[in-house]
Each structure stands twice: as C-alpha cells, then as structure tokens.
Interface confidence: medium
C-alpha cells in the first residue's frame, strides 16, 4: 500500500518550476539536511510533471557537487509499468532509493555518512518512452555532515638548526579548535592554520620550536566532542638525533 505525499504548491524555498501546459514540471527539495557522521540521512525530493498517467520507462538519478554535470552517486531504472526502480549505480553501496518514482518521489537515503559526503546533491528524473522528457533540481539539497573531532595526524619533524617542530592535524565539523600542551608550554593555541582549500574540515596547528624534552599533547575540540593525542620528544643530548 503506497501513500503518496506530494505538495504541488509552489511556495517551497527550493521548489523549481518549468512552465508547461496542464501540470508543470517542478521539484521540491529542502534547502539543507543535517546529520552526523556515521548516521544515515534522507535527502527528500518530490516532483510534479505535465505527462498525465505516464507509465513508460524512467530513470531516477542523483548527482553530487553541481547540477547537470556533477558525478552521479545513484541511478536506477524502472521498466514500463513497473514500480520497482532497479539500482544501476550506488556509489560505495551507500545510496538507496526510498521514494517511488512512479509516485513522483525520488527521495534517497545515504548510509554511514562521512565528512566527505558534505556537499550539495541534485535529483533528476528522465522519461524515455512514448514521451521523452527530463527534469533536474537546479538548487539541490545541501547535505551538512557534522562530526566530533578526530586527530588524523600528529608528528614531530626536524627543523633548521637542530631544532624540532610539532604538527597536529584534526578533522571535524564544525572545524575543531586545536590546542597544544607540553613542557613549559602551558596551554597554547600555537600556530593554527585555517582549513585548507578543498579540505574544509581539516585544521592544522604547529608548534614551531620544541624547547624541552617530554610529552606534547594536541587537543581538538568542537561542539560535538573532543579528542587528544600525544607525541614524545627525547633528544640524545650531545648528539643531533631525537627519539619521538
């Protein structure tokens, strides 16, 4: 028993309409869906179209990044008269159609969310029978993935004049604040680099000069939690090496 829930009004923030006789092409998506890394999220997408009682072949597509040209993350096809949309592509097996395209519903579920899934997604439907037509969401739905901090790298590196520096890189959303603590440091924000272009969830903090032997701890914190990791510096005094 299928229940259809289509709002044909055009007052949604992200309702996109293409004029046509009778019913019009339109797509309804929310501006944003938020979920935490590791969870599953639903990307709602419903549509209306001008082709009454169309039951020919159709294809449902979701793409990421940009409309019309972005890479496909999900695609399924339904044969004439069939309510089953057979999955042809599900990137990493994590995308699953929840909606019934025959009931004007392309809603998608994304499983095991990762920070890399934080982008905009666009739904598209194609008719390919007696009627040839297609329509795609232009604004899409932003999937906002949040995550507690995770320290992805912590290391001690040599620097000029037999000195050493420490680097700590963490990821999270919101981007975590980093702090170093260690011998004669107290609590220091050190030199925190802004998230790198294309790596918006990564933050790096550098301790430019380690002046004392001992344990140096990097703490990453955001509104969802905190994480810490440590490195040890022990120099062989009178020699130029170090053990970390």
């Amino acid at each position: 028993f299928v229940r259809t829930k289509i709002d044909t009004t055009e007052n949604l923030l992200n309702t996109e309409v293409h004029s046509s006789p009778a019913q019009r092409w339109s797509m309804q998506v929310p501006p944003e869906v938020s979920a935490e890394a590791g969870d599953a999220a639903v990307l709602p997408c419903t549509f209306t179209h001008p082709h009454r009682h169309y039951d020919g072949p159709l294809t449902a597509i979701w793409r990421a990044g940009e409309p019309y040209a972005g890479p496909q993350v999900f695609r399924c096809a339904a044969a004439r008269g069939s309510e089953l949309c057979q999955t042809a592509l599900s990137l990493h097996g994590r995308f699953r159609l929840l909606g019934n395209p025959r009931r004007n519903d392309l809603s998608l579920r994304v499983e095991r969310l990762a920070l890399a899934d934080d982008r905009r997604y666009f739904c598209r439907v194609e008719f390919a029978g007696d009627v040839h037509d297609r329509y795609e969401s232009r604004h899409g739905v932003r999937l906002h993935v949040t995550a507690a901090p995770r320290i992805v790298n912590i290391s001690v590196l040599p620097s000029p004049a037999h000195a050493f520096r420490a680097l700590c890189t963490a990821e999270g959303e919101p981007p975590p604040a980093l702090a170093w603590s260690g011998p004669a440091l107290g609590n220091s924000l050190a030199a925190v680099r802004s998230p790198r272009e294309g790596h918006g969830h990564l933050v790096t903090a550098e301790l430019p000069a380690l002046t004392h032997d001992g344990r140096y701890t990097c703490t990453a914190a955001n509104s969802l939690g905190r994480s810490e990791a440590s490195v040890y510096l022990f120099r062989f005094h009178g020699a130029s090496g170090a053990s970390t």
Epitope: K5, V33, G99, N100, D105, R109
Partner: antibody, heavy 123, light 107 residues
Amino acid sequence: QVQLQESGPGLVKPSETLSLTCTVSGFSLSNYGVHWVRQPPGKGLEWIVLIWSDGSTTYNSALKSRVTISKDTSKNQVSLKLSSVTAADTAVYYCARHPYDDYSGYYYTMDYWGQGTLVTVSS
Amino acid sequence: DIQMTQSPSSLSASVGDRVTITCKASDHINNWLAWYQQKPGKVPKLLISGATSLETGVPSRFSGSGSGTDYTLTISSLQPEDVATYYCQQYWSSPLTFGGGTKVEIK
C-alpha cells in the same frame, strides 16, 4: 498481529545508564525499522532515534552523544541505552514501528506503538 | 530543527461540534506531516500521514488539510470517544519534531 513491548528497569540513578529493550512480534526487524520516542510526565513527545531495517541509524543530534541503539533480528529485539541520565530524562519511553522502508513515501512516521515504559531517574 | 507549533493547546466542545486544530511549521515541510491521537493513559495512534491520507480504520470524521507550513486536523462531528490529546509531527527533515499537543475535551 503487530505488537511492540518495552521492558527495562523503572528506576535509574542519576549519572547511570538507562537500558531498555523493545521486543516485537507480528513483523520482522529485517523489513521494518524501529523508533524510540519519549514523553516526560504530562508533557509532549520527543523523538530519540530510528534504527532502519538494515541496521543503519538516524539520531536526534540533541541526544546522540548519550544514545546507543542496536538490534538482534533473530531475537526480535531492539535495545536502547541512554547514558549519564538526569532527572530530565524521566519519561515514558516508547518504541514504535517504522513503516517498510522502500517506496513507502512516509519515511519517518510511526504506525504501531508499544505500550510504553515509565523510567524514573532518582537517587 | 523544524519547530512545530500547535494551537490551541486545549479546547472544549460539545458532542457533534466541528473541531479544528492547527499546526504551523517553522519551515516548509512539503506535506510530510502526520497527526497522532493519544487518549488518556494510552499510546499514540497514527491517524493521518502525508497531511491528508487517513490511516486504515480511522473514522471518516477525521480529515487533514494544508500545505507549505500550515496544516489543519478537523473532526467534523466530535464524539465522546474523541477525547484525547492530538499531536502533529513533521518528517520532512530530521530530527523528527512534534507539536506541543492539543487537548480536546467534551463540554
């Protein structure tokens, strides 16, 4: 017929972990998901978490840091754990069936509910 | 999060009266709205999903309407067995959120 039954201790001490089990019959956890919803005495309903038929989870982010949900399909059971409880967690806790996932068109409604179990947090 | 505001919070009407409960969402929810009935001391029961679709076995005196952000539950002719608290719930966006409830009593 479809039935859901919550069970667990009625009294939990502050800072401890609340553990509840939902035992279902009349349907398979392989095909249907389960929600947990709570209702403080005399107040409204608050959604906690959904475990989908394939074991994926969707949480209320306001509670996620304290919530753990799991299921044992062979035993027809779903368990909920809520850590570090306070008096504000005193409520009737319900499990409810999430309709069949695929093509249902209503992804987050609850078509059958358990009778609920009152959990009081007090020392 | 999408907030759901129900009004009135309580009402008293006579048997046979037409009763209207409204639910306003803080953002568009595209008709992805459910109505539940909770009788005193009982569990919630799904009445309507998709803003307008009546569940099997629910009396036809119950109906739902609305679109965008504004939705309505109507009981065309109030019966004694309709004494309950009614909740709306949106499922367009996670987390799922409920209205505060409307308590319906008989005069």
